[in-house]
């Protein structure tokens, strides 16, 4: 894609302004274009450094302008050089005085190896002096003064590459400033041949294009393009893709175009003469007007484009029937594209006839790299080339060029690509609240690294240690609730920001972990806790029938109320009881149970129980006798917790009677704290005793209580409270 063009305007220097313009068309050189004096061609030319400036009318062009007063210092050979990816291209040209004694037939002359060549200079000033001819500044030939012809010639019957160089002619009394120059370019190979050993056949380079001896490619003259230079450019355009334009009133008049060797220099199509200021004569066209129109059907000959074929005809002479060729046009390509870094699939779409093929469409990166289509398709009217850049990055920003080169011509369209950095939050999201199946999150989407604006935000989440994919929800607010989470599960959370455009999803930001609250199976039903011995309690429950296939077990937690002693016991799920052993006598324990699978279940309510006592129980306390009538009385009492009291016995007898005449009332519910004695005799004194019993035995009453019933008609005395057994 290197297209370097040197415009020499004008090569014959008079008192007018003259210039050299070097254009890098369709590519961006890695190093600046340089314009310098070509001392290889002419050693003894002027030594002054050139004043090279940027050509403001073009993006990649340099210029040297000589004002008329500098005319005497201009004579000599010049070069322009451009470099891209290690490859250098050098174009050479010359400038000479218009008042020189001789003038060359052409500024450059390209011949094939072995050609019979005449280098000719026209005598414009007659002097009584010998004429001398130099090659690259060294004398090679002289003509005595009386034999100097009108056309001074150097004859090379069998040109060889070593014959190439700058030939100059002058009178012996002249100098560099009265010399005429022409450069002979000898292709390393014979006609129609190319290659290191010159044994490959060139393609036809039409319209005076020249086959490059190293690559076999055609170098097309200004005004023609395509692989074989068959296609004429639009009026007054030039360059490999015809996208450069001559800005003069008469187009490319007075512009001498110099291209890389072996092309040399020529006028643009339609012009001839050393100054390229003469129009072609009728019937001629092309660079230097060297091409003759031979239009088959009497079509018009255009001096810029050649035969203008009638509809349905094509070819240089309109000799072929068929749809006329149409220069390709690039369509639907915006001037500016914003791209997100990452994978990028630019599309080049072109029309034309014949339709461009995939090998005829390329994409040139700002650094000069040429990309070929990864994918290609075409409809009746368009070819579509899809390119793939696996990882486009911000340094790839700049001017890219879509290029299409078919037999019908070439077109390039530059467009600007701006590569954006994908956004990424700097902070992890924060967890505000959690339940067993939800979490409230602050997504903390700002600040972020990279480019905005942010089009959308995603909250990504997944359980830790699970091999499942990340789930996500679109988020509009900073605070969001995640629902349908698993209980007692550790989750990972992060935020992904999305900017506009394809592939705008940034990398997820930092990760936050949190754990949901637990929820499990309900606790066992029918829980019952009873003492079994002084050191054991027995916990029982109803059989458990699980709703899933998961393995389960019952976890029982028991702790002592008096001491800091806790134990958790796992019980197989198929059992319905557990004996809690190794306990302390006369100690209160709190027990709870739950059913666990992989997730832990819900705890039951606490159950409490005492282990059986290891001592006799203490006497019931606060014994009161109340509600005395002629035949009844209420006895109330309290007992101390923790002595495994299983029953209370009330013993009474009429005072003075024998011991064996007593009545025992056994109350087997130790929670009952009062009892009504009935069937007593009126106005009778009774002796009442009360004992507590446990697993060890009965308590020892310290003293007896006396109860005297009332006469038959009297109201009851001393109403008492508490639970009463009737």
């Amino acid at each position: 894609a290197m297209d370097l063009i040197l415009i020499n305007s004008l090569p014959l220097v008079s008192d007018a302004e003259t210039s050299l313009t070097c254009i890098a068309s369709g590519w961006r050189p890695h190093e600046p274009i340089t314009i310098g004096r070509d001392f290889e061609a002419l050693m003894n030319q002027h030594q002054d450094p050139l004043e090279v400036t940027q050509d403001v009318t073009r993006e990649w062009a340099k210029k040297v302008v000589w004002k008329r007063e500098k005319a005497s210092k201009i004579n000599g050979a010049y070069f322009c050089e451009g470099r891209v990816r290690g490859e250098a291209i050098r174009i050479r040209t010359m400038k000479m005085r218009q008042q020189a004694s001789f003038l060359p037939a052409t500024l450059t002359m390209t011949v094939d190896k072995g050609d019979n060549v005449n280098i000719s200079f026209k005598k414009v000033l007659i002097k009584e002096e010998d004429a001398v001819i130099y090659k690259n500044g060294s004398f090679i030939h002289s003509v005595p003064r009386h034999e100097v012809p009108d056309i001074l010639e150097v004859h090379l019957p069998h040109a060889q590459p070593q014959d190439a160089g700058v030939y100059s002619a002058r009178y012996i009394g002249g100098n560099l400033f009265t010399s005429a120059f022409t450069r002979l370019i000898v292709r390393r190979c014979e006609a129609q041949k190319w290659g290191p050993e010159c044994n490959h056949l060139c393609t036809a380079c039409m319209n005076n294009g020249v086959c490059h001896e190293d690559t076999g490619e055609c170098i097309c003259p200004p005004g023609f393009m395509g692989r074989t230079c068959e296609k004429a450019c639009e009026l007054h355009t030039f360059g490999r893709t015809c996208k450069e334009r001559c800005s003069g009133q008469e187009g490319c008049k007075s512009y001498v175009f110099c291209l890389p060797d072996p092309y040399g220099c020529s006028c643009a199509t339609g012009w001839k003469g050393l100054q390229c200021n003469e129009a072609c004569h009728p019937g001629f066209y092309g660079p230097d007007c060297k091409l003759r129109c031979s239009c088959n059907n009497g079509e018009m000959c255009d001096r810029f484009q050649g035969c203008l074929c009638s509809p349905g005809w094509q070819g240089l002479q309109c000799e072929r029937e068929g749809i006329p060729r149409m220069t390709p046009k690039i369509v639907d390509l915006p001037d500016h594209i914003e791209v997100n870094s990452g994978k990028f699939n630019p599309i080049c779409k072109a029309s034309g006839w014949p339709l461009p093929t995939n090998e005829e469409m390329t994409l040139v990166k700002p650094d000069g790299t040429v990309l070929h289509p990864k994918d290609f398709n075409h409809t009746d009217h368009f070819s579509v080339a899809i390119f793939t850049i696996h990882r486009i990055l911000p340094p790839d920003s700049g001017v890219w060029v879509c290029s299409v080169n078919t037999v019908a011509g070439m077109v390039e369209k530059p467009f600007n690509i701006s590569v954006k950095v994908l956004p990424k939050p700097l902070n992890a999201p924060n967890v505000i609240d959690t339940g067993h199946n939800f979490a409230v999150i602050n997504i903390s989407s700002e600040p972020y690294f990279g480019d905005g604006p942010i089009k959308s935000k995603k909250l990504l989440y997944k359980p830790v240690n699970h091999y499942e994919a990340w789930q996500h929800i679109q988020v509009t607010n900073e605070i969001v609730t995640l629902n349908y989470l698993e209980p007692r599960t550790e989750y990972e959370l992060c935020v992904q920001l999305v900017r506009r455009g394809e592939g705008g999803e940034g990398h997820p930001g930092p990760v936050r972990r949190f754990t949901t609250a637990s929820i499990g199976l309900p606790p066992p039903r029918g829980l019952n806790l009873l003492p079994k011995s002084q050191t054991t309690l027995n916990l029982t429950w109803q059989p458990i029938f699980p709703s899933s296939e998961d393995d389960f077990y019952v976890e029982v937690e028991r702790r002592s109320v008096q001491k800091s002693d806790q134990q958790n016991i796992k019980v197989p799920g198929n059992l319905t009881s557990v004996l809690l052993n190794n306990l302390h006598p006369r100690e209160q324990y709190v027990v709870r149970a739950r059913v666990n699978t992989k997730a832990q279940g819900e705890w039951s309510e606490d159950l409490t129980a005492w282990t059986l006592s290891d001592i006799l129980p203490p006497q019931p306390e606060n014994i009161k006798i109340s509600n005395i009538t002629h035949s009844s009385a209420v006895i109330s009492w309290t007992i101390l917790d923790g002595y495994s009291i299983s029953s209370i016995t009330i013993r009474y007898k009429v005072q003075g009677k024998n011991e064996d005449q007593h009545v025992d009332v056994k109350i087997k519910n130790a929670t009952i704290t009062q009892y009504q004695l009935k069937g007593l005799e009126p106005e009778t004194a009774y002796q009442v005793d009360i004992f507590a019993e446990n697993n060890i035995g009965s308590s020892n009453p310290a003293f007896s209580h006396e109860l005297v019933t009332l006469p038959e008609s009297q109201a009851p005395a001393d109403l008492g409270g508490g639970k009463m057994l009737l």
Epitope: G86, E87, Q192, G195, P196, E197, N199, H200, L201, C202, T203, A204, M206, D214, T215, G216, E217, R227, T228, E230, G315, P354, T357, E359, V407
Partner: antibody, heavy 117, light 113 residues
Amino acid sequence: QVQLVQSGGGVVQPGRSLRLSCAASGLTFSNYAMHWVRQAPGKGLEWVAVISYDGENKYYADSVKGRFTISRDNSKNMLQLQMNRLRSEDTAVYYCATPKGGALEIWGQGTVITVSS
Amino acid sequence: DIQMTQSPDSLAVSLGERATINCKSSASVLYSSNNKNYLAWYQQKPGQPPNLLMYWASTRESGVPDRFSGSGSGTDFTLTISSLQAEDVAVYYCQQYYSAPITFGQGTRLEIK
């Protein structure tokens, strides 16, 4: 789309002749040099001949020199290979191809020549 | 004539793995004037004509996937497929065009292991 369509293959006895054709479309045929390349059964590729765009220059592999003639008719977009005094070692798939520089870019579909008595 | 020798004659590589084919010329195909290597690579699938993959030793032909790359200079060249795909099963040929007649290597058959 550039296409090269070949014809003219078949079975032929040793010492006899055969003519292969290659019809081009989708390119300015008269601007391109054209090649013939062959491939013996189960073997690699062997270059056979080349002709310049105007038909002026022709070159042949040593193995076919004097027996094969490459020619072209630019008015008909047609390339030919006239094969005389055929030998059993000429048995191969023959391809016509257009160059891209020195590499061969567009190939015909191939035509099978069997030389057998 | 310049002789072209490829190695190995056949190669079996697992899908997704790197495949490397070598080509050696009997004389240098590097032209010092332009520093270009006059070497091309082709892929040929059964029953089909060859398909141009690379020219100038390392310039990928249009439409060729970028898993294919060419390297080397002078007399020693390599075609590399960075991550073998099922559709890459074929015979691969190198060809020099430094000098006429153009000559091809004997081919390397690439299969899936």
